[in-house]
């Protein structure tokens, strides 16, 4: 094929590629007709002037996962057709300014993964056509003013996984057809007013792992096309009351693990597209009425390992479409009875680990399609009759590791769960823990020399379990997990994240890795 | 572009197990649902389980717990269905899936691995 | 766990005419604002393709002579000119619960 070197590999469609850690220059001659060429795991440590001069229909170039260190300024000399660079997962720490010149068709440039300390204006002034930008996994600290200003049709930039301390008002304001930014892990304190408003066109801003701690009130007022905002693993302590109020396509919205302490009355929306709501791991201790009105499609909201100590009975107002609610590892004392009446849908609810002492009748009563409840590890002595008898859906409950208090007036309860026992699980049972002369048998078997009233009893479904709700401890002693967990929903075990140390959430529950495009 | 590559056709012998993978690409891994997906040979749908890669959490059909393991590897963008004890009525192509939110319809499907289990 | 019937089975139509599907529910998955049921094309030796999500939406890049409709237990999708390319098999899906599909429907060229 026009001579192909015999370090590498070259196939009838043009493409070449050459691997191995023999490889310590690139290898020539290239094929002449060559349109793609892959230099992949060598032991390359510089690229000299003019490489590819002789294969100038060049249209994609990866010089990936080599050895890398030193570029000469007109080591791509010759190559106007290269629409896709990449040399990422390398060694650079330097770019040579003017490196990129000439490269007028190039769209895509794929920096990503090496040591780069610092770009310049310079660095990309010529790349007027370039679409995708990836500098992440290097160890910028900062990016100068006027860095991207020529990129103007630059489409998705990446600065992920750097050293930023601070960004400047002015660095993306020319970048007006950008759909996608991404700062995350990142040492960011604050984001300056205004740093967003050229960007029209963002649908997805990710600013997870930083240490953000204030969000200016009207940061993302001209990104009402932003899809996807991802605010997790920050120190937001609080929320601006307009801060979300202009972004109607929102579709994904994390605001995990941070430091927030109280949510206003309709901060979130309004937000048709918005599904799931993830806060866990804040320092939220109550919720007010109204607090989540907006979000009428959401599906799942994760308000788990909080400090939630009271709720008003009109916090959950408008989330007609809501199936998961996890409340689980919280302050929650006592519970309002019309708390949850709007919930018509809610199909899972867990409240483990939390301070209940009681619940009252009616707690359950326009929520008839639940399936699972969590109610382990409480103070909860009894529970009220008929609390559980019109839920005919209902197939796990969780009981065990309350204070159960089994003198005469826990036979309804009782005889409730003889009949139910399938709805239990076999993990755990409830056990009694006064008087002490029953303390640590099982609930369900234990004799109580009462007689026994009759009580309604709502025929078991047929399924004891379905897999949505398995029988996983919610509170595992284990402080590590593994990808194997199995998670009960997002709303139990999902957030159930008691298995990680705060620690290690940083790195846990980040993109990451996975997020390397 | 979303794109869900699976690996290739598997022979294996009664009692065997078996690891299907789902290279995802094209999408940030971690924030989404991953499905899979049973069609035994000139059968319908059939509903395994889920996985939601941010932390590995999973959902399972009961009629496959136990029998079906889903895992993730964050680093490589991977999904894993690890099939194990398998029976003559494993033999199936299965697929992986994308889905936005845990009740969503699936948007994006992997190409299916064929699994045939015959002594 | 919630059973789908699909009807027919199969379907012969002509090219250009009006192809129905049904698909029943045992119970319903529909709130006030949504029905949980999705639809699916699938072509020999492809996988399944989403066509229609939460009943009515078009999933982007479909054609618009595909249409989903129903709410409750009862569901339809509607080819309303069929073309040589729809010659498939269409299932149903729920995810109200544990999800399942429908047995399917298979549509041939009359």
């Known amino acids: 094929y026009h001579g192909c070197p015999s370090e590498c590999t070259c196939s009838r469609a043009s493409q070449v590629e050459c691997t191995g850690a023999r490889i310590v220059a690139v290898p020539t001659p290239l094929p002449w007709n060559a349109m793609s060429l892959q230099i992949l795991n060598t032991h390359i440590t510089e690229l000299n002037e003019s490489p590819f001069l002789n294969i100038s229909a060049l249209i994609a170039l990866r010089i990936e996962k080599n050895e890398l260190s030193r570029i000469t300024p007109g080591a791509f000399r010759n190559l106007g057709s290269l629409r896709y660079l990449s040399l990422a997962n390398n060694k650079l720490q330097v770019l040579p300014i003017g490196l990129f010149q000439g490269l007028d068709s190039l769209e895509s440039l794929l920096l990503s993964s090496n040591q780069l300390l610092q770009i310049q204006p310079a660095h990309f002034s010529q790349c007027s056509n370039l679409k995708e930008l990836q500098l992440h996994g290097n160890h910028l600290e900062y990016i100068p003013d006027g860095a991207f200003d020529h990129l103007v049709g630059l489409t998705k930039l990446n600065l992920g996984k750097n050293s930023l301390t601070h960004i400047s008002p002015r660095v993306f304001q020319h970048l007006g057809n950008l759909q996608v930014l991404r700062l995350y892990e990142n040492r960011l304190t604050d984001i300056p007013m205004g740093t967003f408003d050229g960007l029209v066109n963002l649908q997805e801003l990710a600013l997870q792992q930083n240490q953000i701690g204030l969000l200016s009130p009207g940061l993302f007022h001209n990104n009402h096309n932003l899809q996807r905002l991802y605010l997790s693993n920050n120190h937001i302590s609080q929320l601006p009351p307009s801060v979300f109020m202009q972004l109607p396509q929102l579709n994904r919205l994390t605001l995990f693990g941070n430091s927030l302490k109280e949510l206003s009355p309709g901060i979130f929306g309004p937000m048709p597209n918005l599904r799931e709501l993830w806060l866990y791991d804040n320092h939220i201790s109550s919720l007010p009425d109204n607090v989540f009105s907006n979000l009428r499609q959401l599906q799942v909201l994760i308000l788990s390992r909080n400090q939630i100590s009271f709720i008003s009975p009109g916090a959950f107002n408008g989330l007609t479409e809501l199936r998961e609610l996890s409340l689980h590892t919280n302050a929650l004392q006592d519970l309002d009875g019309n708390v949850f009446r709007m919930l018509a849908n809610l199909q899972n609810i867990s409240l483990q680990n939390n301070r209940l002492r009681q619940l009252p009748g009616n707690i359950f009563a326009n929520v008839n399609g639940l399936m699972a409840i969590q109610l382990q590890n409480n103070q909860l002595e009894n529970l009220p009759l008929g609390i559980f008898d019109h839920l005919g859906k209902l197939c796990e409950l969780r009981l065990y590791d309350n204070p159960w208090r089994c003198d005469s007036d826990i036979l309804p309860l009782r005889n409730w769960l003889l009949l139910n026992q399938p709805r239990l699980g076999t993990d755990t049972v409830p056990v009694c823990f006064s008087p002490a002369n029953v303390r640590g048998q099982s609930l369900i078997i234990i004799n109580v020399n009462v007689a026994v009233p009759s009580v309604h009893v709502p025929e078991v479904p047929s399924y004891p379990e379905t897999p949505w709700y398995p029988d996983t401890p919610s509170y595992p002693d284990t402080t590590s997990v593994s990808s194997t967990t199995e998670l009960t929903s997002p709303v139990e075990d999902y957030t159930d994240l008691t298995t990680i140390q705060v620690t290690d959430d940083r790195s846990v529950w980040g993109m990451t890795q996975a997020q390397s495009g | 572009e979303v794109q869900l590559v699976q690996s290739g056709a598997e022979v294996k012998k009664p009692g065997s197990s078996v690891k299907v993978s789902c290279k995802a690409s094209g999408f940030t891994f971690t924030d989404y649902y991953i499905h899979w997906v049973k069609q035994a040979p000139g059968q319908g749908l059939e509903w395994i389980g889920l996985?939601?890669?941010?932390?590995?959490?999973?959902n399972y059909n009961q009629k496959f717990k136990g029998k079906a393991t889903l895992t993730v590897d964050t680093s490589t963008t991977t999904a894993y269905m690890e099939m194990s004890s398998l029976r003559s009525e494993d033999t199936a192509v299965y697929y992986c899936?994308?889905?936005?939110?845990?009740?969503?319809?699936?948007?994006?499907w992997g190409q299916g691995t064929t699994v045939t289990v015959s002594s | 766990d919630i059973v789908l019937t699909q009807s027919p089975d199969s379907l012969a139509v002509s090219l250009g005419e009006r192809a129905t599907i049904n698909c029943r529910a045992s119970q319903s998955v529909s709130t006030s604002s949504y029905s949980y049921m999705h639809w699916y094309q699938q072509k020999p030796g492809q996988p399944p393709k989403l066509l229609i999500k939460y009943a009515s939406s078009l999933e982007s890049g479909v054609p618009d002579r595909f249409s989903g409709s129903g709410s409750g237990t009862d569901f339809t999708l509607t080819i309303s000119s069929l073309q040589a390319e729809d010659v498939a098999v269409y299932y149903c899906?729920?995810?109200?619960?544990?999800?399942?599909f429908g047995g399917g429907t298979k549509v041939e060229i009359k």
């Open positions: 899906e729920q995810s109200w619960e544990i999800r399942t």
């Open positions: 899936a994308h889905g936005d939110n845990k009740y969503d319809a699936m948007d994006y």
């Open positions: 996985v939601y890669p941010y932390i590995g959490g999973t």
